[in-house]
Amino acid sequence: RDKVMSEFNNNFRQQMENYPKNNHTASILDRMQADFKCCGAANYTDWEKIPSMSKNRVPDSCCINVTVGCGINFNEKAIHKEGCVEKIGGWLRKNVLEQKLISEEDLGGEQKLISEEDLHHHHHH
């Protein structure tokens, strides 16, 4: 399980690097951040380290009330402060890993962080 979490952490951070460059990656991360009410890998300050992201900006999907541009020049009180790796990892442990042995393909690869099916399952429960 620690290996799975470590993989997921590395993959999430890697996809954060791709966020400004890849629309598909961006939409997956946006959906995860919005659905799990989280921001960044460990926390929102991870977005400051992405070279092509302005330091006063997080994706709009980090906002508590998501509106276009809400992540620009954000106030800490207006965004989710919890990191996604802990939050999604905890949910994975509880809801997915205990139900099925998750393969590394399910967790990452180049495009998929969590299978669409799993995300859909979280969204409706």
Epitope: T45, N56, G69, N73, F74, N75, E76, K77, A78
Partner: antibody, heavy 119, light 108 residues
């Protein structure tokens, strides 16, 4: 009413140190980012530093980086600017400024405190 | 860093005149543009935020417009208390927070 009051300015020799304070009242202090902005005599406004609500994020203008340190104490509704290795070009009125962020603009300014660096 | 350029740097006008000050950003800043007024010996005061929204308590003769890189501050009918220095400032991409160099509005 909403108020920011700076203190701690004065005359200091080059390479000296000074600590500015800003006391906030009339609003929930940790709802806001806070800035220090300065204005040299007869010159325009220059941003010096800002700090996030929690104090986790701090940024500085290149001109003061490594010499100035911004901090805040939310329990005491206070903002600080520790200024070390002061130079003549740091001579200015220093303003403590409230920043709601997003597109709202810096909506509350203190009266300013004067820092003069001279031998 | 985003540079802000104001024009003119100084301006002479009479009470009752319509006055326009412009501010240009070195790259697009959407509508993240604010205008401040400063009188001698006083702290700046926020007039307009988000390019065109009037700050509470500011007289309606002040208005702002623009988006992207070009912005204007207009005073529809100058009053004696409006003679001051005006600054634009961007908050789209920070740090640093950047200001224009200021426009000094003087009595003709």
């Amino acid at each position: 009413q909403v108020q920011l009051v700076e203190s701690g300015g004065g005359l200091v020799k080059p390479r000296g140190s000074l600590r500015l304070s800003c006391a906030a009242s009339g609003f929930i202090f940790d709802d806001y980012f806070m800035n220090w902005i300065r204005q040299a005599p007869g010159k325009g406004l220059e941003w010096v530093s800002y700090i996030s609500n929690s104090g986790n994020t701090k940024y500085y203008a290149d001109s003061v980086k490594g010499r100035f340190t911004i901090s805040r104490d939310n329990a005491y509704n206070s903002l600080y600017l520790q200024m070390n290795s002061l130079r003549a070009e740091d001579t200015a009125v220093y303003y403590c400024v409230r920043d709601p962020r997003s597109y709202y603009g810096m909506d509350v300014w203190g009266q300013g405190t004067t820092v003069t660096v001279s031998s | 860093d985003i540079q802000m350029t104001q024009s003119p740097s100084s301006l002479s006008a009479s009470v009752g005149d319509r006055v326009t000050i412009t501010c240009r950003a070195s790259q697009s800043i959407s509508s993240y543009l604010n205008w401040y007024q400063q009188k001698p010996g006083k702290a700046p005061k926020l007039l307009i935020y988000a390019a065109s929204s009037l700050q509470s308590g500011v007289p309606s003769r002040f208005s702002g417009s623009g988006s992207g890189t070009d912005f204007t501050l207009t005073i529809s009918s100058l009053q004696p208390e409006d003679f001051a220095t005006y600054y634009c400032q961007q908050s789209y991409s920070t740090p640093p927070i950047t200001f224009g160099q200021g426009t000094r509005l003087e009595i003709k």
